[in-house]
Interface confidence: low
């Protein structure tokens, strides 16, 4: 595929990445799939600066990110190492709370109203943020 050098329409460029901010809600898996169909992934937060950028754009609204522990350990969807990477959990989080009555614990991470992170039931219909890196190979065929 061709190399993407600028962001798609309605995406926001920042630090050589492109971001798309939803204004509707989906379950985490549906949001994850949406981003993948856009040749992107749910946002992966690698620095405090990126955290603040995303926070600035989403405002005080619960919003999914590309972090989950549905298979055991916490993992970023793009393979970024969780243990050594940036984290911004709320106090006492993640807690894998079972008391919500929806079955199971809490396996998906989202930005809360103050930007810090919480784990929640993956089926909740939250907004989401997609991210794709500039300069990576696009799956779209080159324009002739």
């Amino acid at each position: 595929g061709s190399e993407r050098t600028c962001c798609p329409v309605n995406w926001v460029e920042h630090e050589r990445s492109c971001y798309w901010f939803s204004r509707s809600g989906k379950a985490w898996a549906d949001a994850d799939n949406y981003c993948r169909l856009e040749d992107a992934h749910l946002v992966v937060v690698t620095s405090w600066e990126e955290q603040k950028f995303v926070q600035h754009h989403i405002g005080p609204v619960n919003t999914w990110m590309g972090l989950h522990d549905q298979n055991g350990p916490w993992k970023w969807v793009d393979g970024t190492d969780y243990e050594t990477g940036f984290k911004n959990w709320r106090p006492e989080q993640p807690d894998d709370w079972y008391g919500h009555g929806l079955g199971g614990g809490e396996d998906c991470a989202h930005f809360t109203d103050d930007g810090r992170w919480n784990d929640d039931v993956c089926q909740r219909p939250y907004r989401w943020v997609c991210e794709t890196e500039l300069d990576k190979a696009s799956q779209e065929p080159p324009l002739l």
């Epitope: 620095s47 600066e49 600035h56 911004n88 709320r90």
Partner: antibody, heavy 125, light 108 residues
Framework: QVQLVESGGGVVQPGRSLRLSCAAS????????MHWVRQAPGKGLEWVAV????????YHADSVKGRFTISRDNSKNTLYLQMNSLRAEDTAMYYC??????????????????WGQGTTVTVSS | EIVMTQSPATLSVSPGERATLSCRAS??????LAWFQQKPGQAPRLLIY???IRATGIPARFSGSGSGTEFTLTIYSLQSEDFAVYYC??????????FGGGTKVEIK
């Protein structure tokens, strides 16, 4: 007026502990992130640690990780640095500084805009 | 860790002249850079944040510019009180927050 005053420095033997304090006045302490920054004699500035406005998050430099702990008591308008297992290389002037970028309200207005005058820590046998 | 490199280490300037200080980051820090001034026996003082935004009370003769990896602090028409050590500091990728080694601006 806005002021930060450090205390608790002194001469201490290697391996011993010390707790620094930073008393804040003239502003809403609980709305600001706070840092400790140190400066060895004749050297440049070295960031030591940061704590969020509400104490919920804190980070330490690798050089002090596992030995130093930053904390705060918003009811007392005071920032702390607990220093354990002190080494000769920890000898420095220690400054506290506030930073709105890690505060309650302003996400983009970064900058250590108010500093204390510092407290001297000397680690020597 | 992002390494900040300042040059020159010492800059000799006459009062009234312009001083140009450089700061280079080992990788991009966007515009997330601050400049501090420190006089002997005193705490550092914030001059610039966001690469070019003057902090409260800082005179207009202090000007910051740059983005990415290359930054400049320009002091126009140096006053006697401007002779000091100047540090740059990045807050883009951390921990750790990192400072440059400093540039001493001395009287020529």
């Amino acid at each position: 007026q806005v002021q930060l005053v450090e205390s608790g420095g002194g001469v201490v033997q290697p391996g011993r502990s010390l707790r620094l304090s930073c008393a804040a006045s003239g502003f809403t302490f609980s709305s600001y992130g706070m840092h400790w920054v140190r400066q060895a004699p004749g050297k440049g500035l070295e960031w030591v640690a940061v704590i969020w406005y509400d104490g919920s998050n804190k980070y330490h430099a690798d050089s002090v990780k596992g030995r130093f702990t930053i904390s705060r008591d918003n009811s007392k308008n005071t920032l702390y640095l607990q220093m354990n297992s002190l080494r000769a290389e920890d000898t420095a002037m220690y400054y506290c500084a506030r930073d709105e970028g890690f505060g309650e309200f302003d996400y983009y207005n970064y900058g250590m805009d108010v500093w204390g005058q510092g407290t001297t820590v000397t680690v020597s046998s | 860790e992002i390494v900040m490199t300042q040059s020159p280490a010492t800059l000799s300037v006459s009062p009234g002249e312009r001083a140009t200080l450089s700061c280079r980051a080992s990788q991009s820090v966007s515009r997330n850079l601050a400049w501090f001034q420190q006089k002997p026996g005193q705490a550092p003082r914030l001059l610039i944040y966001g690469a070019s935004i003057r902090a409260t009370g800082i005179p207009a003769r202090f000007s910051g510019s740059g983005s990415g990896t290359e930054f400049t602090l320009t002091i126009y028409s140096l006053q006697s009180e401007d002779f000091a050590v100047y540090y740059c500091q990045q807050y883009n990728n951390w921990p750790p927050l990192t400072f440059g080694g400093g540039t001493k601006v001395e009287i020529k």
